[in-house]
């Protein structure tokens, strides 16, 4: 297993970088298992790697605040979350402590993701040693590949177009700096 030593660009903001609050991406990694894989969140809540892009590997990356995102599986409507030992799982409900990730940009176009609460790096589960400690490895790098393009606009019809939706359910305006861990039972 190769450990890549990259230097994250500090204070990266997905909002500033991508100019949007929500991005659909495939998270491709080529160093998690020495094989190419796309992170996928499955219907049963397990998280793994798919050799090719799949419906389960299409993810929605949504900015919660500068540099911090939530990751949602589009097909399964499950959030990518991380246990305190670094293991990944997919949850139907969002917990700020388990499911918020800091997004760190590398110079080569790859990103590193780490739990905002625990600082543990996001890794695909390894095939080689299933009983490994996920927290003991260096960060895995992910290349965010563009997801499906937005649907083309409907051809002009009889009805007048609706006004643009300027509202947002994104809690950016509500979320302040994270000074402490979310409430939980420490483990």
């Amino acid at each position: 297993h190769h450990h890549h030593h990259h230097h994250p660009i500090p204070d990266s903001s997905p909002l500033l970088q991508f100019g949007g609050q929500v991005r659909q991406r495939y998270l491709y990694t080529d160093d998690a298992q020495q094989t190419e894989a796309h992170l996928e969140i499955r219907e049963d809540g397990t998280v793994g790697g798919a050799a090719h892009e799949s419906p389960e590997s299409l993810l929605e990356l949504k900015a919660l605040k500068p540099g911090v995102i939530e990751i949602l599986g589009v097909k399964t409507s499950r959030f990518l979350c991380q246990k305190p030992d670094g293991a990944l799982y997919g949850s139907l409900h969002f917990d700020p402590e388990a499911c918020s990730f800091r997004e760190l940009l590398l110079e080569n176009g790859y990103n590193v993701y780490e739990s905002e609460a625990h600082g543990l790096p996001l890794h695909l589960p390894g095939n080689k040693s299933p009983h490994r400690d996920p927290a003991s490895e260096g960060p895995a790098r992910f290349l965010p590949l563009p997801g499906l393009p937005p649907a083309p606009p409907e051809p002009p019809g009889i009805l007048a177009p609706e006004p643009p939706d300027v509202g947002s359910s994104d809690p950016l305006s509500m979320v302040g700096p994270s000074e402490a861990r979310s409430p939980s039972y420490a483990s």
């Epitope: 605040k65 799982y89 949850s91 969002f94 388990a98 809690p171 979320v175 483990s187």
Partner: antibody, heavy 120, light 112 residues
Framework: EVHLVESGGGLVQPGRSLRLSCVAS????????MHWVRQVPGKGLEWVSV????????GYADSVKGRFTISRDNAKNSLFLQVSSLRAEDTALYYC?????????????WGQGTLVTVSS | DIVMTQSPLSLPVTPGEPASISCRSS???????????LDWYLQKPGQSPQLLIY???TRASGVPDRFSGSGSGTDFTLKISRVEAEDVGVYYC?????????FGGGTKVEIK
């Protein structure tokens, strides 16, 4: 689909003990905290106890501390509540509930409950 | 412990009309991470509670969008935009900020 089935309730005399069980299916059991919440029939809800995903941390309501013991067996997808030194005021429907995350406080799915009646 | 107070105790509603339930906590439920740790549950007659809203305003999986949660700090509101017959039951708020989690006394919603 999340499924939680409680068992072990029944009629018991004051001062005696019972062991409540909850079998979980439809989700990866060891990814989540688990809770017990109780409800006196016709009354409101009272949180009883929680155990984190790996049994690393446990919490109890003051009203049951020292008398109730929560535990889990992740290999068997099972949650337990050992209830001892029972009192009349422990009479309630006991719900097993899945936590929202490995350590989180919010229960998001509940079982149908098992009724404990403490009476002489 | 944090004390949760709900009002009204009982709420007669007309199908198709809006309804609103209030919940007040004895201390702020706003965490330093910016989230309010306030949940809403519905217990339908003869059933176990089901999660409707968590983190103050986030709808739980499968919950119809006629349900919405709002508020911050110590004052919270659950709104049903258009009540349906299946919405009857007892609604509880619960604080999830600290141990022990505590519930409000409940609001019984019934059809007029």
């Amino acid at each position: 689909e999340v499924h939680l089935v409680e068992s072990g309730g029944g009629l018991v005399q004051p001062g005696r003990s019972l062991r409540l069980s909850c079998v979980a299916s439809g989700f990866t059991f060891d990814d989540y905290a688990m809770h017990w919440v109780r409800q006196v029939p016709g009354k409101g809800l009272e949180w009883v106890s929680v155990i984190t995903w790996n049994s690393g941390s446990i919490g109890y309501a003051d009203s049951v501390k020292g008398r109730f013991t929560i535990s889990r067996d992740n290999a068997k997808n099972s949650l337990f509540l050992q209830v001892s030194s029972l009192r009349a005021e422990d009479t309630a429907l006991y719900y097993c509930a899945k936590g929202i995350s490995p350590t989180g406080t919010t229960p998001d799915y509940w079982g149908q409950g098992t009724l404990v009646t403490v009476s002489s | 412990d944090i004390v949760m107070t709900q009002s009204p105790l009982s709420l007669p509603v007309t199908p198709g009309e809006p309804a609103s339930i209030s919940c007040r906590s004895s201390q702020s439920l706003l965490h330093s991470n910016g989230y309010n740790y306030l949940d809403w549950y519905l217990q339908k007659p003869g059933q176990s509670p089901q999660l409707l809203i968590y983190l103050g305003s986030t709808r739980a999986s499968g919950v119809p969008d006629r349900f919405s949660g709002s508020g911050s700090g110590t004052d919270f509101t659950l709104k049903i935009s258009r009540v349906e017959a299946e919405d009857v039951g007892v609604y509880y708020c619960m604080q999830a900020l600290q141990t022990p989690p505590t519930f409000g006394g409940g609001t019984k919603v019934e059809i007029k």
